[in-house]
Amino acid sequence: EPTMYGEILSPNYPQAYPSEVEKSWDIEVPEGYGIHLYFTHLDIELSENCAYDSVQIISGDTEEGRLCGQRSSNNPHSPIVEEFQVPYNKLQVIFKSDFSNEERFTGFAAYYVATDINECTDFVDVPCSHFCNNFIGGYFCSCPPEYFLHDDMKNCGVNCSGDVFTALIGEIASPNYPKPYPENSRCEYQIRLEKGFQVVVTLRREDFDVEAADSAGNCLDSLVFVAGDRQFGPYCGHGFPGPLNIETKSNALDIIFQTDLTGQKKGWKLRYHGDPMPCPKEDTPNSVWEPAKAKYVFRDVVQITCLDGFEVVEGRVGATSFYSTCQSNGKWSNSKLKCQPVDCGIPESIANGKVEDPESTLFGSVIRYTCEEPYYYMENGGGGEYHCAGNGSWVNEVLGPELPKCVPVCGVPREPFEEKQRIIGGSDADIKNFPWQVFFDNPWAGGALINEYWVLTAAHVVEGNREPTMYVGSTSVQTSRLAKSKMLTPEHVFIHPGWKLLEVPEGRTNFDNDIALVRLKDPVKMGPTVSPICLPGTSSDYNLMDGDLGLISGWGRTEKRDRAVRLKAARLPVAPLRKCKEVKVEKPTADAEAYVFTPNMICAGGEKGMDSCKGDSGGAFAVQDPNDKTKFYAAGLVSWGPQCGTYGLYTRVKNYVDWIMKTMQENSTPRED
C-alpha cells in the first residue's frame, strides 16, 4: 500500500549490523508523486566501489546510488548526510554486508517522503501536445480554441472526422485549407455512394502541400485513401505525388489525413465523383450484343442474340436471345447463359425408307434419307439430304422441313414375262411377272394394285360384293397358298358413277364405265411379288394404236378349266373396235344389237386365240410405257367379251385418270363411317 513517508534502518541499528546479511526495502508513494530519500546517519565498512558492504538505491532499472563509509552533514542546521530525489513513485533500497567486519559499524538511518513532481517540466518528454497544467500529485493537459483533447487526455487535435459524403459529386479539403492544417490531428472522411458506382478521386498537383517525408522516406504528415482491401498512399510532400485520377473500383472510400506536432503546410483539396461501375466487354461465342458499345457501365442492359443455329437451352426448351444487365458488382447478370449449337434431335423415321444414324444432330449436321429400293422411290424430290437448320428442324433444300415420301415404284416387274407356250391360249406366269395382279375370291376375278392403298378393278366385279376379299403376292390361288399370301381388307368400294346398276346384272348389255376403285384399310408393303402398276399419262402418247401389244394376266377360265389355279398370262394386240362388234356373242342374254360399244372401251386380241375370259375380269391390260420402256401401265381393265378366245373388251383407263385421281385424293385419309 503506498505511503507518504517512512523510515528505513539497517539491521540492529544503532547497534552494529551483522555479517553476511542482505535486506531490501520497497518504497512506494502514491501515483503522481516523486520520492525524496535522505540519510541522517551512515556508518558502513568502506571498500573500493563499496564492494564489501553497501547500501544501494535503485529506481526501476537504474542505480541511483551506492553508499559505504562514514558521512557527516555539511550543514550545521541539517542532519542530512546524503539525499536522493527521484520523479518516480517507486524506489528500492538494498543493504548488503560481507562475511567479516574488521571494526564495529553501526549501519544507516534513512527517511523518505512523497514529494510533488512537476510533470510539465521535470521530464524530457513533454506529456501534453499543447498546454500542460501541474498540480500536487498530478497534471492535466488543455487545448487552444477549436482544438479538442483526444481520448488519451494528452493530445489536442481539431475535430475533422465523422463527415460522410453520399452525393455523386463533391469536394473535400484539409481543415483551414489553404491556411496551414492543424497539427497533431487525424481527420477521417467517408465517401459512401450507391452500390454500382465507383468513387473516382481527382487532384491537381498544386492543390497538395503536406509536410515532406523524413530521411527514411516515411511521411510525417500523410494522406491515405482506403477502398475495401485496396490502399492508395500514404502521400506527402510539395505537389501531389500520386496519380491525379484515382479509380477506386469501390463505392466506399475512406480518406485519412494524419498530422504530427510540427511542420504544418497548406494541406490539400480534392474532388471526387461517382462513376457507374464498368462491366467488361465479354467475348460471348456464337452471339451478338445489342447495343454494341465501346464501354458498358452499371445499369446498362444488352440483348444477347444467338447466331443462326445457336440457342440458349434450359431443360427441354430454348430461346434465341436473352438480356444481361451490368450489375452493381461490375459483373453481367445471366453470364451463365451460353449460345450453344441447336440440336435438331434424332430425325423422324419415314415409312418405306430409312435414315442412317447421324454422327451429330447439331446445327449444320447432314443426314440422308433413302427409300427401300427397288420397290420404293422418293416421290417429292429433294434428294433425301437434310441439314440441321438454325430453327432446330431438319431441312431439305427443296422440301424444307417436309419429310421425304417413299412411294412404290410402279409398273416394274421383278422378272419380265416370257411366253413359254401357246388365260386362253396363254402361258403360265409367275406373280413376279405381274406383281400388281390382285386376286378376288368372290366373285372369282382380278384387279390391279395401283398404289399402297388402292386397287383398280372392273365395276361388275364389285357391284355385287362391296366387301371383297383380295389377295396379292401369290402365283397360286390354291387355298393353302392363299393362306400364306397377303390378304387385303377393303375399307370402301367406289364404283364409277357412270356405271349403271341393274336389278339383274346377268342380263347386262352395257359395260360402259366398267371401272371401280377399292380403298384398302391398311397400306400394302411392296416387294418382289407385290408392287403396283402405273396409270396412263394424260398426254396423247398414251393413246393406243391398233396393233399395240399389251399383257393380260389372271386366274380365269382356260381352254381346259373353268378356273386356273396358277397365274396365266398372254400378250395380245389392240384391235379396232369393229373387230369386237363383229364377233357373235356366245350365249347372248339379249339381242346382239343391244350390246353397247363406246370409246371408253378397248378391243384387243384375235391373234392365235389369245384372250381373257370369265374369271379374269378387273385385271390389267398392261402396256409398255411409251416414255419409259422399263415400265408398264394399266391401259385397260378386263371388262367383257363376246366370246372367249376371240376378241375381248377392256375398260379404257386413260379416260378415267381424272376420276381415279380425284377419288383417291378425296379419300386419302381413312373414313370414319
Epitope: 440458349v312 434450359e314 426448351v317 430461346a319 436473352f322 444487365t325 458488382n329 447478370s333 451463365k336 447463359l337
Partner: antibody
Amino acid sequence: QVQLVQSGAEVKKPGASVKVSCKASGFNIKEYYMHWVRQAPEQGLEWMGWIDPENADTIYAQKFQGRVTITADTSTNTAYMELSSLRSEDTAVYYCARSRLFFAYWGQGTLVTVSS
Amino acid sequence: DIQMTQSPKSLSASVGDRVTITCRASQDVRTALDWYQQKPGQSPKLLIYSASYRYSGVPSRFSGSGSGTDFTLTISSLQPEDFATYYCQQQYTTPYTFGQGTKLEIK
C-alpha cells in the same frame, strides 16, 4: 429428377436472425443461379436476391441490402439465405428457385414466423 | 426498380371461358417477361417464358403475347384446374420484380 428441398418452418423473435437452407438434387448448383423469393401471408411474390454458386457472386434487392446474406456450399449442393434483424413484417414463406433463363424449379417453401 | 402492374387484381369466370390477364411494366423490358401460376399452399409454376414461349408440359390453352411494356396472358378455354393466382415477372434487369398477382376464381 430435379428437386429443391428446403429446411423446416422456423419461429423467431424480433431482432433475431434466421438461416434457411435449400438442398438441390438432380443437377449441379454451380451451373445455375439460385434465387430467393418470399411471399408474406395473402401477399404477392417478392424477389430477394440471387447467388452464382460457381463464384459466390451475389446480387440483392435494395430493400434487403445489409440484412440478407445468400451463400452456397457447392460440396453439399446447397444454397442458404440468412435474414437478420428480423421484424414482424418478415413473417413469410421463403422460396428458393433455380434459374438460367427462368425460374423453372422452386423449393416447397419455408415458413418463417417472427413473433415476440 | 421496374414496377410491374397486373390487372385485374381478381376476376371471376366459368369453365370454358376465354380469359385475359394483362401486365404492364413501368419501363421497357423488351420480351424478358415470364408468367407463373400459383395454387394455394403450392410453389409457383412456370407457364410462359420470354413473353410468348410456352414452357414444356404447359397446355396449349395458355398463351402469352406482348413486348416492351404491355403483356397479356390468355387462357383460351378455362378448365377447373386453372383457377389459381397468376403472376408476371420481369427478368430484364435486377432486381427481378413480380406483379402483385391476379386471382382467378370460379364464378
